[in-house]
């Protein structure tokens, strides 16, 4: 049986939502995104609709759109081209987002190499369930053009997040950028705090916090560096940093007998699957300044 | 601790489809994504795809498109993976995986899988 | 894809012995690497992540190193439980890809 295209499929990007003509007496149907990576994605869709929402997806690079519908009489398949229109070279580029002091994150990108003087970008960021869309509160200008955002209020987000930075010009038309990020990969830690070190005659204790996070992090989530260097030594001594997991207390013992130099233990944090590291706490001091042999550990 | 149990042993002959069952106990099916990973004998390991039994989103690689659904029953915790048109090909270990930090299109490590379901297509 | 090339695709040890198992990716993954080991008969078992993280309950005798496109398992002295086939996988990339393993069998 030869497939009629008669769906009138057609493609909302605000909601994602992919919608087509209903058919009488549908036995089944499907629908798909395929983009230029050969990724397909295809959201549930009962019989009863005649749409399907997309959730996770990117639609910068061109996708095409696919709707199959069985009815007892009939085989539909129908595609949808969903190019990004505008003037190729014009979208943002080099997109990128971090948290940083659990609270915060800042956005930024370049404007695109073809895009003209009167450029304008608007960024748009909704949570995965595309429940929620929140509107740059706070523009980082160049020249005039936005080419980055600041967010103090990040509880509309999730553990994935959809960016869409589209563009304005009275010339020509724009392309969009979109980029879905998880919150793993773009949170910056701070570095451990309350780093504590207690000695007795033959070890030294180190002790430090977990460091508070956007996400929900267990204490099994979080991998630790540790710096223990000698103070006042020559340049080119470098020590190995150690590294230490994360634990319901926080701590590391090591041997050091007395009387020892002074020393200083910085450390710093990051996610186990991940590692991006923080930057280095504050230093924390041990030993004294007098000047006899050095316990090397 | 979560875990994972998949179905026995299927024969199919070519052109035939085949529905592989994959039930997770010490979680709910609907805080996970599941993966799906296939073995072919004696060869290495090769991701298929993944879904969202919350949402019934599915990711996969276009060269299994048409052949290829992922489903879940939330009400038994029990993920699914049917194959249809199969081809020789096809014979393999089908693994169900899942992580603790999953989308459907990858997972930060796959901390948990299942036993496997050998799949032999054969005329 | 990124395309996930593991050396050697054999490697004869003693118990006792070390072990080094290299994977190269084709272009950089950052940390997001993990390793896995598969005894005959057994589904794959997650032994290391983001590059060099143990997972929960594996021997400290396992490590793992490197970051952008090279990376290392260590094991530091081989029991006989440990004669298996290791698996790399990138997650920075769509889709998820393992190398095609490095069989690790007794001299």
């Known amino acids: 049986e030869k497939p009629a295209s008669s769906l009138n499929v057609r493609f909302d990007a605000r909601t994602m939502n992919l919608t087509w003509d209903c058919q009488e007496n549908t036995t089944f149907s499907r629908c798909f995104l395929t983009d230029k990576k050969g990724r397909v994605v295809e959201p549930r869709v009962t019989n009863k609709e005649c749409s399907c929402t997309f959730r996770e997806i990117c639609l910068h690079g061109g996708v095409t759109f696919e709707v199959h519908v069985n009815t007892s009489q009939r085989t539909f398949q129908e595609k949808l081209l969903y190019p990004n229109s505008g003037r190729e070279g014009t979208a943002a580029q080099n997109f990128s987002c971090f948290i940083y002091n659990v609270d915060f994150m800042n956005c930024t990108w370049a404007r695109g190499p073809k895009a003209p003087r009167d450029v304008q970008y608007f960024l748009y960021i909704q949570n995965s369930k595309r429940r929620r869309e929140i509107q740059c509160p706070y523009y980082i200008e160049d020249s005039g053009t936005h080419v980055g955002c600041h967010l103090g209020n990040l509880s509309g987000l999730t553990s994935r997040n959809y960016f869409l930075v589209n563009g304005t010009s009275q010339e020509i038309g724009i392309q969009f950028f979109d980029s879905l990020l998880d919150t793993k990969k773009i949170e910056r830690f701070n570095p451990p705090g309350n780093v504590t070190v207690r000695c007795n005659t033959t070890h030294c204790l180190v002790r430090w916090k977990q460091p508070r996070t956007y996400q929900k992090l267990s204490y099994l989530d979080f991998q630790y560096q540790l710096d223990v260097h000698r103070k006042n030594m020559q340049p080119g001594t470098e020590n190995l940093p150690i590294n230490v997991s994360g634990d319901l207390e926080n701590r590391y013992n090591f041997p050091s007998s007395e009387p020892r130099a002074k020393h200083a233990v910085k450390i710093r944090a990051a996610d186990v699957r991940i590692l991006n590291w923080s930057s280095w706490s504050e230093a924390a001091e041990f030993g004294s300044d007098e000047r006899h042999h050095h316990h090397h550990h | 601790q979560m875990q994972l149990v998949q179905s026995g042993a299927e024969v199919k002959k070519p052109g035939a489809s085949v529905k592989v069952s994959c039930k997770v106990s010490?979680?709910?099916?609907?805080?996970?994504?599941i993966h799906w990973v296939r073995q072919a004998p004696g060869k290495g390991l090769e991701w298929m795809g993944g879904f969202d039994p919350e949402d019934g989103e599915t990711n996969y690689a276009q060269k299994s498109q048409g052949r290829v659904t992922m489903t879940g029953d939330t009400s038994t915790d029990t993920a699914y993976l049917e194959l249809s048109s199969l081809r020789s090909e096809d014979t393999a270990l089908y693994y169900c995986?899942?992580?603790?930090?999953?989308?459907?299109?990858?997972?930060?490590?796959?901390?948990?899988w299942g036993q496997g379901t050998l799949v032999t297509v054969s005329s | 894809e990124i395309v996930m090339t593991q050396s050697p695709a054999t490697l004869s040890l003693s118990p006792g012995e070390r072990a080094t198992l290299s994977c190269r990716a084709s272009?950089?993954?950052?940390?997001?690497l993990a390793w896995y080991q598969q005894k005959p008969g057994q589904a794959p078992r997650l032994l290391i992540y983001?590059?060099?993280s143990r997972a929960t309950g594996i021997p400290d005798r396992f490590s793992g190193s490197g970051s952008g496109t090279d990376f290392t398992l260590t094991i530091s002295r081989l029991e006989p439980e440990d004669f298996a086939v290791y698996y790399c996988?990138?997650?920075?990339?769509?889709?998820?890809?393992f190398g095609q393993g490095t069989k690790l069998e007794i001299k």
């Open positions: 995986a899942t992580g603790r930090y999953c989308s459907t299109d990858t997972c930060y490590g796959f901390d948990y």
């Open positions: 272009q950089s993954v950052s940390s997001y």
């Open positions: 983001g590059a060099s």
């Open positions: 010490g979680h709910t099916l609907t805080e996970l994504s």
């Open positions: 996988q990138q997650y920075n990339n769509w889709p998820p890809t």
